[in-house]
């Protein structure tokens, strides 16, 4: 049976140019995270965290994906075209796997302000 | 190479207590949750739990609560299985398992320590 | 609980023969399932995991296939290593249960 539940970030918004941070966080489960997925809203992969391997960013979003914080992801250099929604995988024993949804607005207004629902501890 | 090992077979009394040690190497051992089997003489396989080895939390089957402890020592990548107030019914094989694979679809117990017997008899 | 129910429990069959070991879980696992040969006296050994993966070093006359409920682990040639027990094991969330294994004899 799946206990967990998966907390994100919500609905936020970022200035073009600017960065934000993606984070999703599992809580309520004794089970252990094994790799997060995170996907943009076209299913492409960004950034795979394996509990072995550690982090690997796709090549396509090497120069404005940094991993972290913790199991969250940063992206860089917004534009426009970020503009959309954005999942977390967490793969976990033994439950199965969790999903989490971001949507991310990309603004062009200078006074854009990266509003977040919670902040993780 | 990626290997558990697991402590030599025991004779106990019945009332008394265990012991089992899984040693893993050859990976990083906080990455891989650690599962318990046990199989009495004759018998089939059967999931006793497991143990989160980024946390140390156990995870209990039903019918292997109570008398039944998982623990970790993570500086010397070594899980443990005790059990008290032992019983005949107790004696059988335990091993340890890895459980291999990172996304769900891929789970599976890939690395398995040799057994450790352990027989209770008066 | 998810239930799995191996069939046969006994399997009589030649050097050579093809034969097929049946896994049935009481409800839908999609394909979290593995397959493990056992020696008398030895630990499990993984022979196929999420259905139809072959381990590595695993030799190719063992295939799996199925998934939702029926599952199959399929020895094309048995070889007289191959004369031991097999189990069935779901891995689609807590417990994860094991079959009461197929123990394959020389007929």
């Known amino acids: 049976m799946m206990t967990g539940t998966i907390e994100t970030t919500g609905n936020i918004s970022a200035k073009k140019g600017g960065s934000v941070i993606l984070q999703c966080h599992l809580s309520s489960t004794m089970a252990q995270v094994t790799q997060v997925n995170w996907e943009q809203h076209d299913h492409s992969l960004l950034a795979i965290r394996n509990a072995e391997l550690g982090w690997h960013i796709y090549p396509a979003f090497k120069d404005r994906v940094a991993p972290g914080p913790g199991l969250g992801l940063t992206l860089q250099s917004l534009t426009m075209n970020d503009t959309g929604e954005y999942f977390c995988t967490y793969h976990t024993y033994p439950d199965g796997t969790y999903r989490g949804r971001i949507f991310l607005e990309v603004l062009e207004s200078s006074v854009a302000e990266h509003s977040a629902r919670f902040q993780i501890p | 190479e990626v290997q558990l090992v697991q402590s030599g077979s025991d004779l106990k009394k019945p009332g008394a207590s265990v012991r089992v040690s899984c040693k893993a190497s050859g990976y990083t051992f906080t990455s891989y949750p650690m599962n318990w089997v046990r199989q009495a003489p004759g018998h089939g396989l059967e999931w006793m739990g497991w143990i989160n080895t980024n946390t140390g939390n156990p995870t209990y089957v039903q019918g292997f609560t109570g008398r039944f402890v998982f623990s970790l020592d993570t500086s010397v990548n070594t899980a443990y299985l005790q059990i008290s107030s032992l019983k005949a019914e107790d004696t059988a094989v335990y091993f340890c398992?890895?459980?291999?694979?990172?996304?769900?679809?891929?789970?599976?117990?890939?690395?398995w320590g040799q057994g450790t017997m352990v027989t209770v008899s008066s | 609980d998810i239930q799995l129910t191996q069939s046969p429990t006994f399997l009589s069959a030649s050097v050579g023969d093809r034969v097929t070991i049946t896994c049935r879980a009481s409800q839908v696992i999609s394909s979290s399932l593995a397959w493990y040969q056992q020696n008398p006296g030895k630990a499990p050994k993984l022979l196929i995991y999420a259905a139809s993966t072959l381990q590595s070093g695993v030799p190719s006359r063992f295939s799996g296939s199925g998934s939702g409920t029926e599952f199959t682990l399929t020895i094309s040639s048995l070889q007289p290593e191959d004369f031991v027990t097999y189990y069935c094991q779901h891995l689609h969330g807590y417990p994860c249960n094991f079959g009461q294994g197929t123990k394959v004899e020389i007929k």
């Open positions: 398992a890895r459980t291999g694979g990172h996304t769900y679809d891929s789970y599976a117990f890939d690395v």
